[in-house]
């Protein structure tokens, strides 16, 4: 699927269901208790496919991964399968630097939430990354949305600079990640 970045535009362009960020330096100032606290500004490069690249065209490169911000609404499971079809997985956050990069990207879409690759079967079982690895709350806290009416939000999304649990069936955007070896 081709998504085109118009370099003469100061905003994010959405074509064919993908959001491409310029990683502008002026969006969303850090606020207290947000995930942006103490995060160094990061640089991301969008691939065009013209030069040799470890990422598919129009994915964003950051460190050793390629990222695609999908703007088609889907459940968590549907989003996971959408990423699989693109040879990737829902986002797994491995470091504070990566977290800062992701926050910077999604903060330019303050009205939208994005599924990441964290889920659990039910509240008594720990959160698990999509690849089966353990979740450590040292990296970030998951803010709960649980209520009496909605007692089991067992999937996770990021909204601006906060990570929340949410009902897995709620349609949302998503972030696909494809790791590569340097």
């Amino acid at each position: 699927t081709m998504a085109i970045w118009r370099s003469n535009s100061g905003s994010n362009t959405l074509e064919n269901g993908y959001f491409l960020s310029r990683n502008k330096e002026n969006h969303s100032q850090p606020t207290q208790s947000s995930l942006e606290d103490s995060v160094t500004p990061t640089k991301a490069v969008k691939t065009t496919g013209v030069l040799s690249s470890p990422c598919p065209p129009n994915w964003i490169i950051y460190e050793k991964s390629c990222y695609l911000f999908s703007m088609s609404l889907n459940s968590w499971d549907g989003s996971k399968r959408q990423c699989w079809q693109l040879g990737s997985n829902l986002l797994k956050i491995d470091s504070s630097n990566e977290l800062g990069f992701i926050v910077k990207q999604v903060s330019s879409q303050p009205d939208n939430s994005f599924w990441i690759g964290l889920s659990r079967p039910q509240t008594e079982v720990p959160w698990l990354w999509e690849d089966g690895s353990t979740f450590s709350s040292n990296l970030f806290q998951i803010r709960t949305t649980a209520t009496q009416e909605n007692p089991s939000p067992n999937c996770v999304w990021i909204h601006v600079s906060v990570i929340y649990d949410q009902l897995c069936s709620v349609p949302s955007y998503s972030i696909c990640e494809k790791k590569f070896s340097m």
Partner: antibody, heavy 118, light 107 residues
Framework: QVQLVQSGAEVKKPGASVKVSCKSS????????IHWVRQAPGQGLEWMGW????????NYAQKFQGRITMTRDTSISTAYLELSRLRSDDTAVFYC???????????WGQGTLVTVSS | DIQMTQSPSSVSASVGDRVTITCRAS??????LAWYQQKPGKAPKLLIF???SLQSGVPSRFSGSGSGTDFTLTVSSLQPEDFATYYC?????????FGPGTKVDIE
């Protein structure tokens, strides 16, 4: 490639304890739960519990509470299962397995036969 | 604890046959179910996770389906190396539990 290598077969007397080791390689040991599963001769599979190698947190099946201990040594990427107060019906092959997607067990050790006999 | 039952307990089949094994959970487990193959004297091998996702390296003749309480493992065209015992496993709640197994042997 991911590998889990277990310690050798053991013969124990009733009332004794046994400690089985499971050495991991080919991945970051602290990133994935290690499960222990046992299989009595000619029987099915039985989940005993898990350990989070990063934190050391454990979760044991109620059936084994009080006589099971799971530990790990991150410096040598090894998980351990200790079962005490052994009975003859504890005779089984004990497997370690690495957690994978959706809490499945994607990689298994070769198994350790523990025989409990007087 | 969630009880897992499998049927049939054993099945005789020939190479090329389509074989279907069912697994039922005593309560809903969404899609938190895995399937394993075990041969005598060997450790189990993961075939399917998340009820329907094929583990890397597993032949595409294996497929899984179902959600909630009823699940199916299908082998579309049985090969000589597929004669083994198959187990389902729920990962929805502690303790994780396995089905009793289905033995697939040569007719």
């Amino acid at each position: 490639q991911v590998q889990l290598v277990q310690s050798g077969a053991e013969v124990k007397k009733p009332g004794a304890s046994v400690k089985v080791s499971c050495k991991s390689s080919g991945y970051t040991f602290t990133d994935y739960y290690i499960h222990w599963v046992r299989q009595a001769p000619g029987q099915g599979l039985e989940w005993m519990g898990w350990i989070n190698p990063n934190s050391g947190d454990t979760n044991y099946a109620q059936k084994f509470q009080g006589r099971i201990t799971m530990t790990r040594d991150t410096s040598i990427s090894t998980a351990y299962l200790e079962l005490s107060r052994l009975r003859s019906d504890d005779t089984a092959v004990f497997y370690c397995a690495r957690n994978s997607a959706s809490y499945s067990f994607g990689y298994w050790g070769q198994g350790t036969l523990v025989t409990v006999s007087s | 604890d969630i009880q897992m039952t499998q049927s049939p307990s054993s099945v005789s089949a020939s190479v090329g046959d389509r074989v279907t094994i069912t697994c039922r959970a005593s309560q809903g487990i969404s899609s938190w179910l895995a399937w394993y193959q075990q041969k005598p004297g060997k450790a189990p091998k993961l075939l399917i996770f998340g009820a329907s996702s094929l583990q890397s390296g597993v032949p595409s003749r294996f497929s899984g389906s179902g959600s909630g309480t009823d699940f199916t493992l299908t082998v579309s065209s049985l090969q000589p190396e597929d004669f083994a015992t198959y187990y389902c496993q729920q990962a929805y709640s502690f303790p994780f539990t396995f089905g009793p197994g289905t033995k697939v042997d040569i007719e």
